[in-house]
Interface confidence: low
């Protein structure tokens, strides 16, 4: 079943794409966004844990010697994104016994750049999307997903890794951003807030949504995540905003109903396979795209972000379950697990549709439209 569409057009009411948003207001901690450090990839998701690299849980790269020369996708750690800090930071700490990789968390010391220098890079994620400034790019065709409708068996691993809830995806889920831009899905995870406090990572014209889903993919040009980290287009993340709607979302309920089983940090359970595409908006043709980074350490850049214009609707009860069930490090609730928005530093956000046309309350204001960089594709 497809998730109900919430907003046909710009999920955020069509703002600007935040192209030149050096340090937008969203980059400063808002009242709803408690200051948090940026979250590097979780230790639980370190290679060898069978966690496919996620957008926020991108794998921290283990020395090849530890992996006998190669890391398997299933063994790469996933990366989680940090919360909205007053000043985005990165914190790392040991999380698992036996793990020799640093673990990170939202908030606290040390700053993320100390955990991973890439977290101080110029082209980081998430960002504030301003539809009005987005460059309409007709070459951006509808996304294509293949193999996302999974049978009940084999079951999938659902894990509370301390910074998100992550679903490890089996081989065979293929996604194409366009001709020759093909990827394999590795894992998906969510970002959320707390009671009365939204927790999406990306924002639209400064508006933060209740939650956000990230489906992390590895380019078919690479066999392992560590090979793809930092390479332009090596990783791609599909992101969608989750909003409150009147009805229960049956697709999400298949996951949310199991959260109590993994309330404790580091716990996991097995869930029947489901239609992964039903967790995403139904309109694959309208989206924003830009090049950024993992939103948690190692904060590797070169990640292609595709943010759906259409949102997904969950009931109020479901959103509450998401934000109020899991526990993270140090006997603290796992909440507000999002990183602050990062400056665009000259990046242009592209749109597959004319997002700046009659889509924003500011439409009457003169706007400098950006041009599509891939118009000839």
């Amino acid at each position: 079943q497809r998730l109900p569409r919430m907003q046909e057009d710009s999920p955020l009411g069509g703002g600007s794409s935040g192209e030149d948003d050096p340090l937008g207001e969203e980059d400063l901690p808002s009242e709803e966004d408690s200051p948090r450090e940026e979250d590097p990839p979780g230790e639980e998701d370190l290679p060898g844990e069978e966690d496919l690299p996620g957008e926020e849980d991108l794998p921290e790269v283990k020395p090849k010697s530890e992996e006998e020369g190669s890391l398997k996708l299933e063994d790469l750690p996933t990366v989680e994104a940090p919360g909205d800090p007053q000043e985005p930071q990165n914190n790392a700490h040991r999380d698992k016994e036996g793990d020799d990789q640093s673990h990170w968390r939202y908030g606290g010391d040390p700053p993320w750049p100390r955990v991973s220098p890439a977290c101080a890079g110029r082209f980081q994620s998430p960002v504030d999307i301003r539809p009005q400034l987005a460059a309409f790019c007709p070459a951006l065709r509808p996304l294509e997903l293949l193999g996302f409708q999974l049978p009940p068996l084999p079951e999938l691993r659902l894990r509370n890794n301390g910074h998100s809830v992550q679903l490890t995806l089996p081989p065979g889920l293929e996604m194409a951003l366009g001709p020759g831009r093909e990827y394999r899905a590795l894992q998906l995870h969510l970002h959320w807030g707390a009671a009365g406090r939204p927790g999406s990572e990306h924002t639209v014209e400064g508006h933060r949504f209740p939650a956000e889903i990230h489906v992390v993919h590895l380019s078919t040009a690479f066999a392992r995540v560590d090979e793809a980290l930092g390479r332009p287009g090596g990783l791609a993340v599909l992101a969608a905003f989750l909003e409150e709607g009147p009805e229960e979302n049956s697709a999400y309920e298949q996951l949310l109903s199991r959260l109590e089983e993994i309330a404790e940090e580091g716990s996991e359970t097995q869930v029947p396979g489901l239609d992964i595409s039903a967790l995403l908006p139904s309109d694959f043709s309208r989206y924003f795209q830009y090049e950024g980074s993992l939103t948690t350490p190692p904060c590797a850049q070169g990640v292609i972000w595709t943010v759906f214009n259409q949102t997904v609707m969950l009931s109020a009860k479901q959103l509450h379950t998401l934000s109020d069930t899991l526990w993270g490090p140090g006997d603290s609730r796992l909440q507000l697990n999002f990183r602050a928005t990062q400056p665009l530093n000259g990046r242009v956000i592209e749109a597959s549709f004319p997002a700046g046309v009659d889509s924003s309350p500011r439409a009457a204001e003169p706007v400098q439209l950006n041009s599509c960089l891939a118009a000839g594709d």
């Epitope: 294509e144 997903l145 293949l146 996302f148 409708q149 194409a176 020759g180 093909e182 239609d275 694959f284």
Partner: nanobody, 120 residues
Framework: QVQLQESGGGLMQPGGSLTLSCAVP????????IGWFRQAPGKEREFVAA????????QYSDSAKGRFTISRDNSKNTGYLQMNSLKPEDTATYYC?????????????WGQGTQVTVSS
């Protein structure tokens, strides 16, 4: 209502070959996957093969692997299913479909089918 049009069906002897064609409206073929399905009398419709809109990904049912080949020519807005080493059990009405994903559940457009009969 968008309608896909299959052609190429007919009566064939076992071991023979046949190529089915599927004409797809331009706006659909540009970015939709194409799938082939078949339905034998008294049986449910079953998946045969599918190809992504870029042509870079193909999927086959177990019965089609090694004998059938799916392809597409976007310049002609047409998809193809080449069937070799035909068997009597391949007798069915063959349908083509177009959709965002290769799985039939999300196929938006269907043809009316073309009959393939394999008999000696």
């Amino acid at each position: 209502q968008v309608q896909l049009q299959e052609s190429g069906g007919g009566l064939m002897q076992p071991g023979g070959s046949l190529t089915l064609s599927c004409a797809v409206p331009r706006f659909t073929l540009d970015y939709y996957a194409i799938g082939w399905f078949r339905q034998a009398p008294g049986k449910e419709r079953e998946f045969v093969a599918a190809i992504s809109w870029s042509g870079g990904t193909t999927q086959y049912s177990d019965s089609a692997k090694g004998r059938f080949t799916i392809s597409r020519d976007n310049s002609k807005n047409t998809g193809y299913l080449q069937m070799n080493s035909l068997k009597p059990e391949d007798t069915a009405t063959y349908y083509c479909a177009a959709g965002r994903q290769l799985e039939w559940r999300t196929y938006d457009y269907w043809g009316q089918g073309t009959q393939v009969t394999v008999s000696s």
